[in-house]
Interface confidence: low
């Protein structure tokens, strides 16, 4: 017979929830590990079991589903807290099994506290808005499934500590927050507080996200190679160190992969025998345009190395460019003392 398929602790799903707020947590087995859903499993006679290990303890315990007002409950493949308490923090395990099958996964749940300005250790999602790009919206995240569509919650939006009222270019519209024209000054943390009734009680859901204003696709250009260029010649004597920077500017492009690489005589540096090192540094502008610099270095260059072709390449979703560096061997200066001696040699 097979052992329980133990997926271990799924730290990719580091779940954080606010103290004293409802939380609904789906068993990750069905979302990320198994090829069937809860309904299929349930119809096949499999049982979903939950247990947990408290923070700083190593004792696995059953979850107490008999708390007053059903504070913790399970509904299909969802574990509900109505609401959470600080000491609910721990590793939670959901296990699917019958007598012939078993699969389980654990995940960390952290209940965090927030202050009156919504500051907390919560890791915040980032929403990018294009600069000066027309009306753009953000939506209050992760509130689906908390209340039925018949319930009409109230939603209040905040920027940092301040309730958004009479802002110039930011307008609350229920679950959405509209930016009429996004500017760098709109960078910051935005919080929606959703309030809804359930069984005679009032619950609050607090969701904070970071807005980052980035370069607009309207202004995006293919990569621009600033160096190497036609004005700089890398003139070296054999035995000297050759250093050639490749500096490339990339416009911000959502989900674009920016790449920079060198070729030497048409080959990647890894594919040739010379002792070459490449160091890369990256910097960003306020709108997340990117400048990448890759410095090609040959510690003791040979006369053969100085005859090679060194080309910097760059690629983004907007296109690909390349530029060759001008490399040449320094011509030695005439050694006059010797020449004079020879010239006046025999008369």
């Amino acid at each position: 017979s097979e052992r329980c398929d133990d997926w271990g602790l799924d730290t990719m799903r580091q779940i954080q929830v606010f103290e004293d707020e409802p939380a609904r947590i789906k068993c990750p087995l069905f979302e990320h590990f198994l090829k069937f859903n809860y309904s299929t499993a349930h119809s096949a006679g499999l049982t979903l079991i939950w247990y947990w290990t408290r923070q700083d303890r190593d004792l696995e315990e059953p979850i107490n589903f008999r708390l007053p007002e059903n504070r913790i409950s399970k509904e299909k493949d969802v574990l509900w807290f109505r609401p959470t308490l600080l000491n609910d923090t721990g590793n939670y395990t959901c296990m699917l099994r019958n007598t012939t099958y078993c699969s389980k996964v654990a995940f960390p749940l952290e209940v965090v506290q927030k202050d009156s300005c919504f500051n907390s250790p919560m890791k915040l999602p980032v929403h990018k808005l294009y600069i000066e790009y027309g009306i753009q919206r953000i939506t209050c995240p992760n509130v689906d499934g908390y209340f039925p569509s018949s319930v009409k919650p109230t939603i209040t939006w905040y920027m940092g500590c301040y309730k958004i009222q009479n802002f110039n270019n930011v307008i609350p519209e229920g679950m959405n927050l509209s930016f009429l024209i996004a500017l760098i000054s709109n960078n910051g943390n935005y919080t929606c507080v959703v309030t809804y009734p359930e069984n005679g009680r009032t619950f609050h859901l607090t969701r904070t996200l970071t807005v980052k204003v980035v370069g607009s696709p309207k202004n995006a250009v293919p990569p621009v190679i600033h160096s190497p260029n036609d004005h700089v010649v890398y003139e070296k004597e054999p035995g000297e160190e050759l250093l050639i920077p490749c500096t490339v500017y990339f416009s911000f492009l959502m989900d674009s992969r920016n790449e920079v690489w060198w070729t030497i005589d048409g080959k990647k540096p890894d594919d040739i025998t010379i002792d070459v090192t490449i160091n890369e540094s990256i910097s960003h502008s306020r709108t997340e345009d990117e400048t990448r610099t890759q410095i090609l270095s040959i510690k003791k260059v040979t006369s053969e190395d100085l005859k090679r072709s060194y080309v910097c390449h760059a690629r983004s979703a907007k296109g690909e460019v390349a530029k060759a560096a001008k490399v040449k061997q320094k011509v030695p200066a005439p050694r006059y003392t010797v020449e004079l001696a020879c010239g006046f040699g025999a008369t």
Epitope: S1, E2, D58, L59
Partner: antibody, heavy 119, light 111 residues
Amino acid sequence: EVQLEESGGRVVQPGRSLRLSCAVSGIDLDNYAMGWVRQAPGKGLEYVAVISSDGFFYDASWAKGRFTISRDNSKNTLYLQMNSLRAEDTAVYFCARDRGTSTGSLDLWGQGTLVTVSS
Amino acid sequence: DIVMTQSPSSLSASVGDRVTITCQASENIGNGLAWYQQKPGQAPKLLIYGASTLASGVPSRFSGSGSGTDFTLTISSLQPEDFATYYCQCTYWNPDYIGGAFGGGTKVVIK
């Protein structure tokens, strides 16, 4: 103080049945998996069966069909029903508590009850 | 079924000695291993679970290591009360059982 106390061990003839009990005090039985481990005279420990907190039970392969573990949470008692006993079942039977709902490691043990199968 | 093989079956040592007992599983059991100590006429006592985690109240001279199939229990400096028999146990989940097979035991006696 948490205590586990086994009872029901005695001399029994081969082929007969016997039920062992383990009375648990100081904890809620339904919060833990519980198990039985036996030890023949002068020999090592041998796993018999475990019942998880939610009632799934797991017998050692040699015990299947002859030994059945059960629990009555309302009486805070664990049982081991042993049928078709053989001479090689002679042992001290320990009742033990799992560290949690289903960890496999047993952190609290009773003092054991002796079962002797002999004609 | 998983078979647990413990070695040595007995060893003689003196107070202050460093003692190492090994346990081998017939197949990969991850870190699903516990170690117990048993003295004559007494019930076993849990020392280590999860291959390396010390159970509550167990002195720090006991340590466990290993994963997969090979495991070790080490007593860094043997004390008079440590003369006993030590057992490893597979605690790996299985639909047929939780926990399971014990090793044959290692008896630590006074040299």
